[in-house]
Interface confidence: low
């Protein structure tokens, strides 16, 4: 006869491991007992359990409550056992020794491999701002046994660097993703992908990129200066910019307070029927958490009684 077993048994941390040992004998042969021991290199054999044809299963004190026979129906020639709730410390070499009648003893070894699935974590880097050089966008760390694979899935252009720290029974892998921030990256997903044999599917953690920026400000509404004459209704100035976070707008007048009747509505400055009092220098102040921009315009309200044409000055400042 001969023993049938597996070279390697792989189990995920916390699951039950079936350690197979089946005697395929000739007709009439019987199994008297199956002794299981742990036989790691450099250490003496440590008894695990004894499965006897007459008195059943005996488990060594070190494994009490953790070793069982597989559920029925059972074949008398099957010396397999279940190791409950596998832990990392269970990883190693095991031997089953089968005593048969009349053929004698047989032995076989197997390796138990306990997979420790990683619990990855993603840590965003410092706040991303347009104009920075190569900057850490995020780092992703996963520890497991064996060492997990950590990669990045993104359409954003960047560079990755990885480092690994080996511990006694596991390895921690950290991968960093660096990029040069630009506004086009806003809202783009940056996904850390962790692969490991103990995972049914890759684990993915997604970080949404936020790149702070603020575009130059400009003011619209003064394209046709001739429209800015005494009595005109509905005159307005509109401040143009864009940013992340979306900017807020504030209007002031450089040469005094805003005239009465002038309405501030976010990015728009609305005027009542124009009078010469509305002539002046108006400043749109655009800001977000990243930066601020100013754009100022000079409004000259024309008096139809006067002939002289007036020039319009547009000045932008950051």
């Amino acid at each position: 006869g001969e023993l049938e077993t597996s070279d390697v048994v792989t189990v995920v941390l916390g699951q039950d491991a079936k350690l197979p040992c089946f005697y395929r004998g000739d007709s009439g042969e019987q199994v008297g007992q199956v002794a299981w021991a742990r036989v790691d290199a450099g250490e003496g054999a440590q008894e695990l359990a004894l499965l006897h044809s007459k008195y059943g299963l005996h488990v060594s004190p070190a494994y009490e409550g953790r070793v069982e026979q597989p559920p029925p129906p059972r074949n008398p020639l099957d010396g397999s056992v279940l190791l409950r709730n596998a832990v990392q410390a269970d990883e190693g070499e095991y031997e089953c020794r089968v005593s048969t009648f009349p053929a004698g003893s047989f032995q076989a070894r197997l390796r138990l491999r306990v997979l420790v699935p990683p619990l990855p974590s993603l840590n965003p880097g410092p706040a991303l701002e347009e104009g920075q050089g190569l900057t850490l966008a995020a780092s992703c760390t996963a520890e497991g046994s064996p060492a997990p694979s950590v990669t990045w899935d993104t359409e954003v252009k960047g560079t990755t660097s990885s480092r690994s720290f080996k511990h006694s029974r596991s390895a921690a892998v950290t991968s960093e993703f660096h990029l040069v921030p630009s506004r086009s990256m806003n809202g783009q997903p940056l996904t850390c992908v962790v692969s490991h044999p103990g995972l049914l599917q890759d684990q993915r953690i997604t970080h949404i990129l936020h790149v702070s920026f603020l575009a130059e400000a400009s003011v619209r509404g003064l394209e046709d200066q001739n429209l800015w004459h005494i009595g005109r209704e509905g005159a307005m100035l509109k401040c143009l910019s864009e940013g992340q976070p979306p900017p807020s707008y504030n209007w002031t007048r450089l040469d005094g307070p805003l005239p009465s009747g002038v309405r501030v509505d976010g990015d728009t400055l609305g005027f009542p029927p124009l009078t010469t009092e509305h002539s002046g220098i108006y400043v749109c102040h655009v800001s977000n958490e990243f930066s601020s921009r100013d754009s100022q315009v000079t409004v000259d309200v024309l008096d139809p009684q006067e002939d002289s044409g007036k020039q319009v000055d547009l000045v932008s400042a950051s």
């Epitope: 809202g187 949404i208 509109k238 976010g266």
Partner: antibody, heavy 118, light 108 residues
Framework: QVQLVQSGAEVKKPGASVKVSCKAS????????MHWVRQAPGQGLEWMGI????????TYAQKFQGRVTMTRDTSTSTVYMELSSLRSEDTAVYYC???????????WGQGTLVTVSS | SYVLTQPPSVSVAPGQTARITCGGN??????VHWYQQKPGQAPVLVVY???DRPSGIPERFSGSNSGNTATLTISRVEAGDEADYYC???????????FGGGTKLTVL
């Protein structure tokens, strides 16, 4: 995942107003502009305007100036588009779309059919 | 205001390459975005910033933009590509979004 869920179909009489809602989820509501685009039956896409969910400022297409109002409620992550003085030619599917700076639309609502008929 | 001109229709046999153009004055100076719209559905972004593809969009979809013409190219056309395609830009001078009139792609 990002979702934009719009209110249901509306039937309105000429001269009335309609208010369509668009509830955002799956992302930071105040971090992205929201646009409204409409499409008349058998016609192309027509941009109506944009709202900044953070500050509430808006820019409207010249064609709709004076008739459209876009608002938002940050507490419910919802934007609204109200169109007044409805005419039969306003019959269309109205879409909200999340704007990416650039500007393009990476996520769209499912659309709301507004029918204007006497 | 800025105008984008698309051919009303383009026909192509399966497996061939379809090219849909979008004309506009000096459009090469603008970022062009392309959307696919199938009947009864909302538009879907297929190309942005002239030639970039969102995740999930097949590599068969590509874009280019120079001079007065932007082009959406669909290689190895499949029956499922039959749809309306729209180009779009942001016109800074008018502070407005502009769509092309749309092109119906028919797979023969």
């Amino acid at each position: 995942q990002v979702q934009l869920v719009q209110s249901g179909a509306e039937v309105k009489k000429p001269g009335a107003s309609v208010k369509v809602s668009c509830k955002a989820s799956g992302y930071t509501f105040t971090g992205y502009y929201m646009h409204w685009v409409r499409q008349a039956p058998g016609q192309g896409l027509e941009w109506m305007g944009i709202i900044n969910p953070s500050g509430g400022s808006t820019t409207y297409a010249q064609k709709f100036q004076g008739r459209v109002t876009m608002t938002r409620d940050t507490s419910t992550s919802t934007v609204y588009m109200e169109l007044s003085s409805l005419r039969s030619e306003d019959t269309a599917v109205y879409y909200c779309a999340r704007g990416r700076l650039g500007t393009y639309f990476d996520y769209w609502g499912q659309g709301t059919l507004v029918t204007v008929s006497s | 205001s800025y105008v984008l001109t698309q051919p009303p229709s383009v026909s192509v046999a399966p497996g061939q390459t379809a090219r849909i153009t979008c004309g506009g004055n000096n459009i090469g100076s603008k970022s062009v975005h392309w959307y696919q719209q199938k009947p009864g559905q909302a538009p879907v972004l297929v190309v942005y910033d002239d030639s970039d593809r969102p995740s999930g969009i097949p590599e068969r979809f590509s874009g280019s933009n120079s001079g007065n013409t932007a082009t959406l190219t669909i290689s190895r056309v499949e029956a499922g590509d039959e749809a309306d395609y729209y180009c779009q830009v942001w016109d800074r001078s008018s502070d407005q979004v502009v769509f092309g009139g749309g092109t119906k792609l028919t797979v023969l």
